[in-house]
């Protein structure tokens, strides 16, 4: 049994860090193969991850974590057995994808402007509170060339954007995501999306 | 917000014992390493212990054997146990929060040794 | 065990004027590990700067930290009143592992 693409590791910079990796043949990961992993910080301990399968010979598996800062690192074993198939190091904040933003809410009924909602993936205590940026894709039901990205830079989760910008009559969906541009951090997975129908009053025409 | 709430200082005889105890707010306790630290009168900080999120201890070498701290995540508390209090342990206490630094600092509490 | 010395022992300046406050260590240590603190007279520490360099979160733009190695520095660009303290480095690393300068107190001259 061997590795045959090393495990690579994305931290959500929270409490879960995700490792994956490929054996080399068809592999039950989860009774023949343990990741262990520990935080070199003298009051931690080795901790044990029971992964997943992953397709065929692909392996996942999901790490617990202290709250990440900076400066940790951690040694990853990858074990099949008492055999030692692999060892490495993993820093979480250089290998960063944000939680995805929730609750989308699109708000319709503040005169002609539609207003878009929705919650920052982290508690205030968390160093990537602060340091969110997003973008937001809206997008038709019924024209898929209809596809627009609003980058929001400001750290506030909303955007506020004209209900005429849209076509009247139809409707549309949105989805959010987030990145930190301080860990030079992936882009998080999209929010779920959500629905709503746009009409607004056009305006008279002026002869 | 972070809130770290420290009680049980007071004052004791030397050979005396006391509890002190920290509860944290506003963040994951059991996820956080917890410090206790302290400053004589008129002095400087000094590391007396830490303890890690699976229970892992360390302390000074000035107060091993005669302090022992320990953690409830379901209360999100931490404590100082402190026997054999001496003159040289008279300081204002603080529990921390952080790993490799402390984030964040209870107010303090002074423990007082006098006979 | 290693010994962060602070220099100087106390700053006399005035409001506006720039401060720079050293800490040597008597052995190197890894810059992610050093931290730098405020402490105000009857109030808990705060921290200012970690890993060396930067700020932790709320801590003004006029704060800065620099350095590797043995030699740290803490600048304040321009003291405001509000700065007048005892400000203490603080390192993580060998036996004991926690361990802190004895300060530099920035007074009003």
């Known amino acids: 049994m061997k590795v045959l693409q090393e495990p690579t590791c994305v931290s959500d910079y929270m409490s879960i860090s995700t490792c994956e990796w490929k054996m080399n043949g068809p592999t039950n990961c989860s009774t023949e193969l343990r990741l262990l992993y520990q935080l070199v910080f003298l009051l931690s301990e080795a901790h044990t991850c029971i992964p997943e399968n992953n397709g065929g010979a692909g392996c996942v598996c999901h790490l617990l974590m202290d709250d990440v800062v900076s400066a940790d690192n951690y040694t990853l074993d990858l074990w099949a057995g008492q055999q030692l198939l692999w060892k490495g190091s993993f820093k979480p904040s250089e290998h960063v994808k944000p939680r995805a933003p929730g609750n989308l809410t699109v708000h319709t009924n503040v005169s002609d402007t539609l207003l878009l909602t929705w919650s920052n993936p982290y508690p205030p205590d968390n160093y990537l509170y602060n340091h969110l940026t997003y973008a937001v894709n809206i997008w038709s039901e019924n024209d898929p060339a209809d596809f627009r990205i609003y980058n929001v830079t400001y750290l506030e989760p909303s955007l506020r954007i004209a209900a005429s910008t849209l076509k009247s009559g139809i409707s549309y969906r949105a989805r959010v995501r987030a990145w930190a541009q301080c860990y030079n951090t992936t882009w998080s997975e999209w929010s779920p999306s959500t629905k709503w129908h746009n009409s607004y009053r056009e305006p008279f025409e002026q002869h | 917000e972070v809130q770290l709430v420290q009680s049980g200082g007071g004052l004791v005889h030397p050979g005396g014992s006391l509890r002190l105890s920290c509860a944290g707010s506003g963040f994951t306790f059991s996820r956080n390493a917890m410090f206790w630290v302290r400053q004589a009168p008129g002095k400087g900080l000094e590391w007396v212990s830490g303890i890690g999120t699976g229970g892992a201890t360390s302390y000074a070498d000035s107060v091993k054997g005669r302090f022992t701290i320990s953690r409830d995540n379901a209360k999100n508390s931490l404590y100082l146990q402190m026997n054999s209090l001496r003159a040289e342990d008279m300081a204002v206490y603080y529990c921390?929060?952080?790993?490799?630094?402390?984030?964040?600092w209870g107010q303090g509490t002074l423990v007082t040794v006098s006979s | 065990e290693i010994v962060l010395t602070q220099s100087p022992g106390t700053l006399s300046l005035s409001p506006g004027e720039r401060a720079t406050l050293s800490c040597r260590a008597s052995?190197?240590?890894?810059?992610?590990?050093l931290a730098w603190y405020q402490q105000k007279p009857g109030q808990a520490p705060r921290l200012l700067i970690f890993g060396a360099s930067s700020r932790a979160t709320g801590i003004p733009d006029r704060f800065s930290g620099s350095g590797s190695g043995t030699d740290f520095t803490l600048t304040i660009s321009r003291l405001e009143p509000e700065d007048f303290a005892v400000y203490y480095c603080?390192?993580?690393?060998?036996?004991?592992?926690?361990?802190f300068g004895q300060g530099t107190k920035v007074e009003i001259k």
């Open positions: 052995q190197s240590v890894s810059s992610s590990y």
């Open positions: 603080q390192q993580y690393g060998s036996s004991p592992p926690w361990t």
């Open positions: 921390a929060r952080g790993r490799y630094w402390y984030n964040n």
